[in-house]
């Protein structure tokens, strides 16, 4: 069971300091951006991190949304990352959900975060280069010190 708590506005970066944004095709991508680029591209660079109370504490449960014309929420349905047009629900009556990720700091590094899927144990949000694009994907990882599954989250509130 997940119950919605408060939300915060955040900028998410990979460890190469590239900024996560949602492109015109609703794809989550990373790009080099100056602070002014980041502001100019808002709200596509501003993510709503919705925190949830978890009936089985396993880290901070979050849903990640973005509000452009409508609110879209990050999903890892079938292990594929996409933004679905939906509001994060107030309650989820299950211990797993395709929109819930566990946000945890990397041991010894409070500013570096990992996001593990609640639906797929051992699968993490990751940044991966595909041709010329840096994409946000869901990746099964058993080397947890890999920088591709680490992110920084800068609060904008």
């Amino acid at each position: 069971y997940f119950g919605k708590l408060e939300s915060k506005l955040s900028i998410i970066r990979n460890l190469n300091d590239q900024v996560l944004f949602i492109d015109q095709g609703n794809r989550p991508l990373f790009e080099d951006m100056t602070d002014s680029d980041c502001r100019d591209n808002a709200p596509r660079t501003i993510f709503i991190i919705n925190m949830y109370k978890d009936s089985q504490p396993r880290g901070m449960a979050v849903a990640i949304s973005v509000k452009c014309e409508k609110i879209s929420t990050l999903s890892c349905e079938n292990r594929i990352i996409s933004f679905k047009e939906m509001n994060p629900p107030d309650n989820i009556k299950d211990t797993k959900s395709d929109i819930i990720f566990f946000q945890r700091s990397v041991p010894g590094h409070d500013n570096k975060m990992q996001f593990e899927s609640s639906s797929y144990e051992g699968y993490f949000l990751a940044c991966e280069k595909e041709r010329d694009l840096y994409k946000l994907i869901l990746k099964k990882k058993d080397e947890l010190g890999d920088r591709s599954i680490m992110f920084t989250v800068q609060n904008e509130d």
């Epitope: 504490p57 396993r58 880290g59 566990f102 945890r104 990397v106 041991p107 010894g108 590094h109 593990e116 144990e121 051992g122 099964k140 058993d142 080397e143 947890l144 010190g145 890999d146």
Partner: antibody
Framework: QVQLVQSGAEVKKPGASVKVSCKVS????????FHWVRRRPGKGLEWMGR????????KYAERFKDRVTMTEDTSTDTAYMELSSLRSEDTAVYYC???????????????????WGQGTLVTVSS | DIQMTQSPSSVSASVGDRVTITCLAS??????LTWYQQKPGKAPKLLIY???KLQDGVPSRFSGSGSGTDYTLTISSLQPEDFATYYC?????????FGQGTKLEIK
């Protein structure tokens, strides 16, 4: 309690291949990997590689990658490690081990080698 | 590759002694470090994971500490059954790498 039972000792000639098996008995959760580790006489533990039973993807240590093949038969819960072009320096005890997530009190994951096979002695001698 | 430098390579001690073994990683391994004990003719046995978390069933005289690149295994009061070889293992990145091992012998 998970147990790993390995095949018996082998004596091989230089240039030959050896295939060691590792059978899982007992209840094992999903989301584990098989790793292979060896210990040569008078030396320390050495990681050889791993296989993911979910998709058969492998990662090998650079020094073994041209000679080692790790496979897994999900229907029999058995992992295999084949080492080819054997030389005398490959004389060692070979271990299979499971690589699984353990979690701390905040749910943070850590992978550990928890269950180990009893070891298989491979002797390479002419 | 991440290098794990373990020291000392061997140590002689008596029952009741306090023993410390260290592992130095060539880069930050984010506490993805485990400690194993191996006795002759036996498979390694997990003692500590996540640098400082005691595996179930392991006596509390064993403890681990460290972060970043520096890690320590401490046995607070040696018992006769503790004489064995100890290894650290970094699980941060492939290839996984073990320390060279520390042989703990009776003085």
């Amino acid at each position: 309690q998970v147990q790993l039972v390995q095949s018996g000792a082998e004596v091989k000639k230089p240039g030959a291949s050896v295939k060691v098996s590792c059978k899982v008995s007992g209840e094992i959760s999903t989301g584990y990997y098989f790793h292979w580790v060896r210990r040569r006489p008078g030396k320390g533990l050495e990681w050889m590689g791993r296989i993911d039973p979910e998709d058969d993807s492998t990662k090998y240590a650079e020094r073994f990658k041209d000679r080692v093949t790790m496979t897994e038969d999900t229907s029999t819960d058995t992992a295999y490690m084949e080492l080819s072009s054997l030389r005398s320096e490959d004389t060692a005890v070979y271990y299979c081990t499971t690589w699984r997530i353990y979690r701390d009190s905040s749910g943070r994951p850590f992978y550990v080698m928890d269950a180990w096979g009893q070891g298989t002695l491979v002797t390479v001698s002419s | 590759d991440i290098q794990m430098t373990q020291s000392p390579s061997s140590v002689s001690a008596s029952v009741g002694d306090r023993v410390t073994i260290t592992c130095l990683a060539s880069e930050d391994i984010y506490t993805y470090l485990t400690w194993y004990q191996q006795k002759p003719g036996k498979a390694p046995k997990l003692l500590i994971y996540g640098a400082n978390k005691l595996q179930d069933g392991v006596p509390s005289r064993f403890s681990g500490s460290g972060s970043g690149t520096d890690y320590t295994l401490t046995i607070s009061s040696l018992q006769p059954e503790d004489f064995a070889t100890y290894y650290c293992l970094q699980g941060s990145k492939f290839p996984l790498t073990f320390g060279q091992g520390t042989k703990l012998e009776i003085k």
